[in-house]
Interface confidence: low
């Protein structure tokens, strides 16, 4: 039998063989072609299921096809989920979690925004009271309290009398910005720490003055008597 392949009956990319019985050419087609001579293009977009995954759009080409992928997918058949997190879009130590065609930033506490780029200003609600000065911190705030106040929000009026600063039986009165000592009779000073000098000016005419608490006594010189040795 003559070799039917001599006349090149098959498309150039096909493999030709000869039927040993009939002597006719057998064309084995490359992918994407059909027909007796493998010269007809297979429309991959029309036969059966869409070869493009994830709703990619199929475009027929000579001997093949192309997939035009939807947002978030890539690859010859749109089979690969694009990792939108590779560019590191999330800020402030947020975790980026890849989603179809987009990403989600899971923020660390204290941050917000699509990219966790916004430091939440916890001072916005004016949390510090009694004249405290608010300073914004990551996931919190701090209050610098004026004298006489304490607590995380300066909400506590410090009881300066708690340490019993007043001496000699004085009465301690708590004030917004400190305390006041109200001295018992015979004492003076901020803390009532000093005994009032009842010998000044010298009340004893002819004798030595002895200071007491809110009082004095006179030690008279020989020959003198009376409360003031007068």
């Amino acid at each position: 039998l003559d070799d039917a392949c001599v006349s090149n009956p098959c498309h150039e990319d096909a493999i030709c063989d000869t039927n040993p019985v009939s002597g006719r050419a057998i064309c084995t087609c490359p992918p994407g072609f059909t027909g007796g001579a493998c010269d007809q293009d297979v429309d991959e977009c029309s036969i059966g299921a869409n070869p493009c995954e994830h709703l990619g759009r199929c475009v027929n080409t000579q001997g093949s096809f192309l997939c035009q992928c939807g947002r978030g997918y890539t690859g010859p058949r749109c089979e690969t989920d694009v990792n939108e997190c590779l560019s590191g879009p999330c800020r402030n130590q947020a975790t980026c979690l890849d989603r179809i065609g987009q990403f989600t930033c899971i923020c660390m506490a204290g941050f917000t925004g699509t990219y966790c780029e916004v430091d939440i200003d916890e001072c916005q609600s004016s949390p510090c009271v009694n004249g405290g000065v608010c300073k914004d911190r990551v996931n919190g705030f701090s209050c610098t309290c004026p004298s006489g106040f304490s607590g995380s929000m300066c909400q506590l009026d410090v009881d300066e009398c708690a340490s019993t600063p007043c001496r000699n039986g004085a009465k301690c009165v708590d004030q917004p910005d400190g305390y006041e000592c109200r001295c018992a009779e015979g004492f003076e000073g901020t803390l009532c720490e000093r005994n009032v000098d009842d010998c000044s000016p010298d009340p004893c005419h002819h004798g030595r003055c002895v200071d007491g608490i809110a009082s004095f006594s006179c030690a008279c010189a020989p020959g003198y008597t009376g409360i003031r040795c007068e």
Partner: antibody, heavy 115, light 108 residues
Framework: EVQLVESGGGLVQPGGSLRLSCAAS????????MSWVRQAPGKGLEWVSV????????YYADSVKGRFTISRDNSKNTLYLQMNSLRAEDTAVYYC????????WGQGTLVTVSS | DIVLTQSPATLSLSPGERATLSCRAS???????LAWYQQKPGQAPRLLIY???SRATGVPARFSGSGSGTDFTLTISSLEPEDFAVYYC?????????FGQGTKVEIK
């Protein structure tokens, strides 16, 4: 077919350890964040931990922090949960799930902590 | 932490009736990152809704999600026998990720 299959559950004494595994197939595992979620008998769902696709970031529920460790081997398409210092309250069905809103769940594996 | 409160705890309805499930957040859920799940006894949960209102693949159109900020709703327009189950909402806006305590939809 997208599939997650957990294994490694069982009975363990308080203070003991277990390592759960989750074999993934049918999707690009290395591009997906993965989570563990648990459900105590007769109770609701509780998020346990999450790991980013690259394994670079992990987060945990306060109830397991310092005791559980999530990890992954992208070359093996497998997610892990190492559970140490187990307590009775850790008794639950443990599910592995894809991403952070869970498009795919495993069938779950039961962990029982009891003396 | 964002606390999710679902109501009611139990909903007793007949097939064909409309079911309305509520999920309220203790603070605003950023970008409406809220999902709904259905769980039947002995089964893993199944994703129904993500992004507050987007139906997951293969979920029937009778399921719909709505809401934003702190108030979210799952509606089942006409209950089918297979819809009787427990439903959970979940936020994935901030760590820790949290779930609601669940709403059981039972046959009346």
């Amino acid at each position: 077919e997208v599939q997650l299959v957990e294994s490694g559950g069982g009975l363990v004494q308080p203070g003991g350890s277990l390592r759960l595994s989750c074999a993934a197939s049918g999707f690009t595992f290395s591009s997906s964040g993965m989570s563990w979620v648990r459900q105590a008998p007769g109770k609701g769902l509780e998020w346990v931990s999450v790991i980013a696709s690259s394994g670079s970031n992990t987060y945990y529920a306060d109830s397991v922090k310092g005791r559980f460790t999530i990890s992954r081997d992208n070359s093996k398409n497998t997610l892990y949960l190492q559970m140490n210092s187990l307590r009775a309250e850790d008794t639950a069905v443990y599910y592995c799930a894809r991403s952070i809103f869970y498009t795919t769940w495993g069938q779950g594996t039961l962990v029982t902590v009891s003396s | 932490d964002i606390v999710l409160t679902q109501s009611p705890a139990t909903l007793s309805l007949s097939p064909g009736e409309r079911a309305t499930l509520s999920c309220r957040a203790s603070q605003s859920v950023r970008s409406n990152y809220l999902a709904w799940y259905q769980q039947k006894p002995g089964q893993a949960p199944r994703l129904l809704i993500y992004g507050a209102s987007s139906r997951a693949t293969g979920v029937p159109a009778r399921f719909s999600g709505s809401g934003s900020g702190t108030d979210f709703t799952l509606t089942i327009s006409s209950l089918e026998p297979e819809d009787f189950a427990v439903y959970y909402c979940q936020q994935y806006s901030n760590f820790p990720i949290t779930f609601g305590q669940g709403t059981k939809v039972e046959i009346k």
